[in-house]
Every structure is written in C-alpha cells, then in structure tokens.
C-alpha cells in the first residue's frame, strides 16, 4: 500500500516517501522507487537553515553599510548573517533590516537603560532630589549635592534639571 | 518464494535486435520497481533500464538510451527489454531485478546475449 | 556519473580471518550504497543496504560502515562459502553505478 504520512526528515511525493536533505542542501531531484532524493551544497553566500526540498537556497541578508548596518555573524550554508548597527545607531526592527541613531535623555532626564545595537536608550524623568542637566545617552540622573556632609547649608533648592546650590552657614545665627 | 525467471537471449549479430522478458512470481509485482542490469564477461555489473511500478517512469544510462526500451505488463507478472541496434559491446549476461528498499533485493538467474558475427 | 572505485581488486584470505573491502565514490552519495555478493555461477545477492543495514537472512559476520565518500564491507572471521565478487552500488544519483568489485578468495 502506498504510504499516506511520511517519518520525520520525509516527505510524500507520488505516492512515496523521500529523504528531505539536510540544512545546507538544496533538491536536485525527488527521490524514486531506485534512487534517495538527490541534493546539492548551497552555494557560497546562500543557506538553508532546516531539512527541505527547496529546488533554490535563499540569499544571505546584506548588510549594508549605507543603513548603518555592520555584520555580527557572517552566515554559513545552514545560518544567515546576522547584521548590527554601527556604534551609536539601534536597529529599527527585529529584523535589524535598518539603523536610527541612539536617543539622548534630555536635561531633566536620565539614562535608564543604555542603548544597543537592537534596543534605543530608556530614558526616566529624574525624581525628587535627582537631576540631569545635559541632553545625553549614556548619562544617569546624578543625586543632588548634599551640603550638609560638607557642612554647608542648600542657598538654592535643586530641580530635575539643577543641582542644589550649598553655601556657607549662616554665623550670625 | 520470490523468482525471477530471465528468456530471449541468444546470439545476433551487430545491429540486430531482440527481446529479452522476465516472469515475475512470489510477490505482488505491481508494487515494485523493476530493473534490468548485465554483466560483461570481466564481471563488471552495468545498470541497463529501470521502470516504476505503474510503468510510467522510465530510466536509461546515456550508452543504452534511444536502443532499449524498457517495458512491464503487470497483469502478466512480466518485464521486458527490448534491445535494438545491438553492437559487440552488448554482449553480456541480461539479469532482471525487483527494486526494494531502492537496493536490487532480488536478481534473476540471468539471459545470455551475444552479439557477434 | 559517480565513479565507485573498490579495492583491493583481489583479496586472498585465511578462513577464520577478518577482511575489510573498501569502496570509495568520486563525490559525497551521504550513505546511500548497497553491497552485493556474488558466489561462483550465482547471482548477485543484496548484503547491505544503506552503507550499514543489515539485511534479513545475512549472517551477521558481514556489517558495512561509512558515509560521504569512504565505505567499508567487513567480515569477521572469514568462511568457505563467503568466496567471491563483492560489489558496492550507489543510488545516490542517476546513472545508478556499481564498483568494479573485489574478489575474495582462498589464500
């Protein structure tokens, strides 16, 4: 009887089943009642990254310098190539097919998280007693001075976006 | 039992033709592919024809292709090769074979065929 | 045309010895090979299909190993009726091929 469902790593082809061929390898040909299914090496620059009977391998991505893009893991005939972006620039998607510049944390932010090649920089309003007086990505909100450890007194009150102003004691008091 | 049963050699001389047929018993001979391969006085093997089970698909190396024809009646139990344009070359015990498991799994006792003058 | 070169081409042996027959193809065929045996005035019979899978009714002396290009029909300990042409086949590809064959025999 002619089979109906196939093993793993076949598949079903006039009323037979063949080999599927490995990652790296394209069909050639289908498998017969004589001969296993025939299958070549991807070409350089080319993969297939699961068992298959694709009659064509797929391109390796480019990387193009012209989006930002660099390579992070050139491809082989069973991987891609994985690109990245440029120092400074993020990629647009997961799939990294674009770079933007990294976002800077304006003055009265601070930098949550620093950016990557994949990921844009996280920027957090600076809290109480916390500020951020430059537009920066890599830059946290710093902790306000504390004019007391320096046995001064605050002679201006800090803000997101300013330190505290310590001056002297005042001697006459 | 499985049996294959190989008739028609003989001696032709070169450009003649002649029919070459294997009795098939012992398993359901439409379920399998079947091939012919000979066997030259050195005891080299050479793959001749081969035909699928339904008797569609059909396969020659290039030094036979367009003077063998390779034929099955399933109704009959039977497989055929029909050799044309015969040279000194063709000379050879003819062995018909079932296809099982992609791998010759049984041989006939084999047909003479000798083309001289 | 894969080529399919065995050696050696004779093999004179002691019965109860081991022997090893190679058979190496002229492009990767990944484990598809069989290995036949023919006895004097016989047929060829099927041994080994697959490079290594033994084949029901074989006596379990004959084993085959290999993939790619290099292949190897073992038998251990070697007996009077193993004498013979053996024959590698590959199925890899059209035109099916078989090797010029290795003839072993008594020592």
């Known amino acids: 009887e002619p089979p109906t469902a196939c093993r793993e790593k076949q598949y079903l082809i006039n009323s037979q089943c063949c080999s599927l061929c490995q990652p790296g390898q394209k069909l050639v040909s289908d498998c017969t009642e004589f001969t296993e299914t025939e299958c070549l090496p991807c070409g350089e620059s080319e993969f297939l990254d699961t068992w298959n009977r694709e009659t064509h391998c797929h391109q390796h991505k480019y990387c193009d310098p012209n989006l930002g893009l660099r390579v992070q893991q050139k491809g082989t005939s069973e991987t891609d190539t994985i690109c990245t972006c440029e120092e400074g620039w993020h990629c647009t998607s997961e799939a990294c097919e674009s770079c933007v510049l990294h976002r800077s944390c304006s003055p009265g932010f601070g930098v949550k998280q620093i950016a990557t090649g994949v990921s844009d920089t996280i920027c957090e309003p600076c809290p109480v007693g916390f500020f951020s007086n430059v537009s920066s990505a890599f830059e946290k909100c710093h902790p306000w001075t504390s004019c007391e450890t320096k046995d001064l007194v605050v002679q201006q009150a800090g803000t997101n976006k300013t330190d505290v102003v310590c001056g002297p004691q005042d001697r006459l008091r | 039992e499985v049996k294959l049963v190989e008739s028609g050699g003989g001696l032709v001389k070169p450009g003649a033709s002649l029919k070459l047929s294997c009795a098939a018993s012992?398993?359901?001979?439409?379920?399998?592919?079947m091939s012919w391969v000979r066997q030259n006085s050195d005891k080299r093997l050479e793959w001749v024809a081969s035909i699928s089970s339904g008797g569609d698909d059909t396969y020659y190396p290039d030094n036979v292709k367009g003077r063998c024809t390779i034929s099955r009646e399933n109704a009959k139990n039977t497989l055929y090769l029909e050799m044309s344009s015969l040279k000194t070359e063709d000379t050879a015990l003819y062995y018909c074979t079932r296809a099982g498991g992609k791998a010759m799994d049984y041989w006939g006792q084999g047909t003479s065929v000798t083309v001289s003058t | 045309d894969i080529v399919l070169t065995q050696s050696p081409a004779t093999l004179s042996v002691i019965p109860g010895n081991s022997v090893s027959l190679s058979c190496r193809a002229s492009q990767s065929i990944r484990d598809n090979l069989h290995w036949y045996q023919q006895k004097s005035h016989e047929s060829p019979r099927l041994l080994i299909n697959y490079a290594s899978q033994s084949i029901s009714g074989i006596p379990s002396r004959f084993s085959g190993s290999g993939s790619g290009t290099d292949f190897t029909l073992t038998i251990n300990s070697v007996e009077t009726e193993d004498f013979g042409i053996y024959f590698c086949q590959q199925f890899n590809s059209w035109p099916l091929t078989f090797g010029g064959g290795t003839k072993l025999e008594l020592k």
């Open positions: 012992g398993f359901t001979f439409s379920n399998y592919g």
